[in-house]
């Protein structure tokens, strides 16, 4: 806390400019009017203030706006934003996407800081849902943003926003998150034709159920192995050898290299060996010929 001292004669700041970097902490406190600082906040970013001087400037704004800064000040915080704590940011009411962009720009190229996470949380809660423009902005700055949300939070994403999602935005999503996103993507892309639909839906298929995979197998989609390996194991297991062959097309040969990994390993265990042999890939581990397969889960359901 900086002590209250009178401003020396002739040192009163008329504007926020570079001469202020030569002021000591107490001089900044005494000679810079907080209201002046608030109206000329955009100038701070062009002045090489020290960390300590930034602390003084922040303190002045805190005193002027104890209930939280107005958006007109927030939008021009620049690198002073990085001096804010999550507690400070929780007092703000940020409604403009331009303000959000301006502050994300300050942290561009770096991992999401606690300040940025709090800012985004405040912004999204204020909007009530993750609309397309917001999602566009957030994934542009933080490709992994979508996958940092819980399935509950993802449920508030409207299907229309899915158009903003790029494949790399889903790289770190787990199956629970894809379970929520897949139905939204299916709805969003439902009016597209076969090949275009597959290109768009491909990144979301880690949340697809068996029946949708069966339907895709009838459309000559030629799914690559990387996508296949990300499918839900429980969705892959009921697929027949013929369906997997149609689903993968020319990529079916890649199964051999993945035969020890899920979901391929578990799928092989569920297939008849003579069906696997028809692929000519040398896949081993299927159900030997002559064995009867009982689906106990079906039996339990009937009883």
């Amino acid at each position: 806390e900086v002590e209250k001292t009178a401003c020396p004669s002739g040192k009163k700041a008329r504007e926020i400019d570079e001469s202020l970097i030569f002021y000591k902490k107490w001089e900044l406190e005494a000679c810079v009017d907080a209201a002046l600082l608030a109206t000329q906040m955009d100038r701070v970013n062009a002045i090489p203030f020290t960390y300590e001087q930034l602390d003084v400037l922040k303190h002045k704004l805190d005193e002027l706006y104890p209930q939280g800064y107005p958006e007109s000040v927030i939008q021009h915080l620049g690198y002073l934003f990085l001096k804010m704590s999550p507690e400070d940011i929780r007092k703000w009411n940020v409604t403009s996407l331009e303000t959000l962009k301006a502050l994300l720009e300050v942290n561009k190229g770096h991992e999401m800081s606690p300040q940025v996470a709090t800012l985004i949380d405040r912004f999204v809660k204020g909007r009530g849902q993750l609309d397309k423009d917001t999602l566009d902005t957030l994934t542009a700055f933080y490709p992994g943003y979508l996958c940092s949300l819980s399935p509950e939070e993802l449920s508030s994403v409207p299907p229309s926003s899915i158009w903003a999602v790029r494949p790399q935005d889903l790289d770190t999503c787990d199956p629970r998150q894809l379970d929520v996103l897949y139905p939204k993507a299916r709805l969003a892309f439902q009016n597209m034709n076969g090949s275009e639909y597959f290109v768009k839906i491909q990144s979301f298929l880690g949340g697809a159920p068996t029946e949708d995979l069966k339907a895709l197998s009838q459309q000559n989609v030629s799914m690559d192995l990387a996508t296949f390996m990300k499918l839900r194991t429980d969705a892959v297991l009921p697929l027949t050898v013929a369906e997997v062959q149609k689903l993968l097309g020319p990529h079916v040969e890649g199964l051999k290299a993945e035969e020890r990994h899920r979901p391929v390993r578990d799928w092989i265990l569920r297939q008849r060996q003579d069906d696997l042999d028809t692929l000519g890939l040398g896949l081993q581990g299927g159900i030997p010929n002559g064995y009867l397969v009982l689906d106990l889960s079906m039996q339990e359901a009937l009883s």
Partner: antibody, heavy 119, light 107 residues
Framework: QVQLVESGGGVVQPGRSLRLSCAAS????????MNWVRQAPGKGLEWVAV????????YYADSVKGRFTISRDNSKNTLYLQMNSLRAEDTAVYYC????????????WGQGTLVTVSS | DIQMTQSPSTLSASVGDRVTITCRAS??????LAWYQQKPGKAPKLLIY???SLESGVPSRFSGSGSGTEFTLTISNLQPDDFATFYC?????????FGQGTKVEIK
Amino acid sequence: QVQLVESGGGVVQPGRSLRLSCAASGFTFSSDGMNWVRQAPGKGLEWVAVIWNDGSNKYYADSVKGRFTISRDNSKNTLYLQMNSLRAEDTAVYYCARDRGPLWPLDYWGQGTLVTVSS
Amino acid sequence: DIQMTQSPSTLSASVGDRVTITCRASQSISRWLAWYQQKPGKAPKLLIYKASSLESGVPSRFSGSGSGTEFTLTISNLQPDDFATFYCQQYTSYSRTFGQGTKVEIK
């Protein structure tokens, strides 16, 4: 006068960890930002990481993100660099250097400590 | 990240020469550029900051200019003590990046 003295360097095997320290004196340590910069043998300078005066913000070069952690103890006037999952390409002289603000250059440097990653 | 490109990588000169080193940024960095001098086995030393401001104690034969993406370091009257490697560095973003260096050697 400002003095920065690095320590903790040495020979370490790939995949192992090492912690470097930088003892600061001659200025108000808690007021200034601190950086680590490295220089591989016969190569140029590579900025590694920065930590703000109060430890509130830390930034890293892409080459060390997720493996190295910068930290400071203002009560001990000491800067640290925790280096995990070390690789041969991390072999370098590591310097600590001071900056006074986000838009300030590195005005004081230590003499460096050599880290050699080799099996 | 912002890339910094220095040229030339090596420069041969004689005592008394005027030498110029160029540094180019991959995007505008306003005037947030520093120049450092490093001698073998020693730590780098700050010469110029904010593109053209001379660090205290640095001889006036060193000067810097430029803004945006193009910057130059000039040594007006090369002295025996000036043979070293020079680096530019941007500090407009929190990832501070260096140029690859320019070695000034005796012709």
